[in-house]
Interface confidence: medium
Amino acid sequence: PGPPPGPPRVSPDPRAELDSTVLLTRSLLADTRQLAAQLRDKFPADGDHNLDSLPTLAMSAGALGALQLPGVLTRLRADLLSYLRHVQWLRRAGGSSLKTLEPELGTLQARLDRLLRRLQLLMSRLALPQPPPDPPAPPLAPPSSAWGGIRAAHAILGGLHLTLDWAVRGLLLLKTRL
């Protein structure tokens, strides 16, 4: 009569799944904050820093009411993929000045990668539609100078911190709606 059936597959509790994602996001938020502070101490920022290749802000107070889990996770994953690419670029092309931020920048990259894999897993566990494979992004041009690399680092870490900050709030809110 064949082998006995295996134990019934327990469907994951979506709130618990989301909880662990929130914890990872909070942890990365704290790491980013510390690294941004370290960067400010070593290379004080004069004014604001922008990088056109960074994603535009996805969330604000007004957007919270209409949040839907699939949209948030898809957008968050896309934005964090972009930040991962920018962190990788910064480590490669940022110049010798930014080597003083190692190994912290490498740790940040690894944790960002881990959060992305966690988001991917969460989306499949919750049976959310998987986003299409990401089109190859155009390569980022190397900074024009050492100071250009430092300005880019301020923009990348500042943008990532803001994105993660809103992500924590959005994910906490979505958890209450599950």
Epitope: R26, L29, A45, G47, D48, H49, N50, L57, S60, A61, G62, A63, G158, G159, H161, L162, D165, W166, V168, R169, L172, L173, T176
Partner: antibody, heavy 117, light 110 residues
Framework: EVQLLESGGGLVQPGGSLRLSCAAS????????MNWLRQAPGKGLEWVGV????????FYADFVKGRFTISRDNSKNTLYLQMNSLRAEDTAVYYC??????????WGQGTLVTVSS | QSVLTQPPSASGTPGQRVTISCSGS????????VNWYQQLPGTAPKLLIY???LLPSGVPDRFSGSKSGTSASLAISGLRSEDEADYYC???????????FGGGTKLTVL
């Protein structure tokens, strides 16, 4: 360095109007939601309202709805609070503050508004 | 009457550990992040704790936050005279669609 500098406070009669400004510098103003909060003399903190980074959404505390309006000019890095139909109980130090998520991470030094006849 | 409830005062001697409580409901603390602010005499408030227990850069790790259910607390260990200030808890309230604060706790270092 992030800086927020409020101005426009002063003495105004009950029923009168006043417009407060908050000049922002040291960060990309157009990326952040901005708030107004207030503190009556000797009292606690009170949230007045928030405007989203692109001005598309605004939320207000019940006690100011219909009387106060928050606006911003991202090209000038400035936040505004238009206060109409002022009452004695609106007397307070008014603060602008930046919101990156659920909290106020930077505050201005405040500007005093006194409503009295 | 504040939406969040804090004791009006707290005190301790230098080196001691003090805790300030903040209680709310499911529509604010229960469902949303709790933040704490410190207001030194005559100055603007300053962010002390965000997302329940995270410290902004520059805040010493003598300060810590925690949350359980609809209550939160702020702990200060190794109390110093410069910690004498007003402390406020805060959270978003889903019912009111806005930010609510506790009435504030005046901390005295004896």
């Amino acid at each position: 360095e992030v800086q927020l500098l409020e101005s426009g406070g002063g003495l105004v009669q009950p029923g009168g109007s006043l417009r407060l400004s908050c000049a922002a510098s040291g960060f990309t103003f157009s990326h952040y939601d901005m708030n107004w909060l207030r503190q009556a003399p000797g009292k606690g903190l009170e949230w007045v309202g928030v405007i989203s980074y692109d001005s598309s959404n605004k939320f207000y505390a019940d006690f100011v709805k219909g009387r106060f309006t928050i606006s911003r000019d991202n090209s000038k890095n400035t936040l505004y609070l238009q206060m109409n139909s002022l009452r004695a109980e609106d007397t307070a130090v008014y603060y602008c503050a930046r919101t990156p998520g659920s909290h106020f991470d930077y505050w201005g030094q405040g500007t005093l508004v006194t409503v009295s006849s | 009457q504040s939406v969040l409830t804090q004791p009006p005062s707290a005190s301790g001697t230098p080196g001691q550990r003090v805790t300030i409580s903040c209680s709310g409901s499911s529509s604010n603390i229960g469902n949303n992040a709790v933040n704490w602010y410190q207001q030194l005499p005559g100055t603007a408030p300053k962010l002390l704790i965000y997302y329940d227990d995270l410290l902004p850069s520059g805040v010493p790790d003598r300060f810590s936050g925690s949350k359980s259910g609809t209550s939160a607390s702020l702990a200060i260990s190794g109390l110093r005279s410069e910690d004498e200030a007003d402390y406020y808890c805060s959270a978003w309230d889903d019912s009111l669609n806005g930010v609510v604060f506790g009435g504030g706790t005046k901390l005295t270092v004896l």
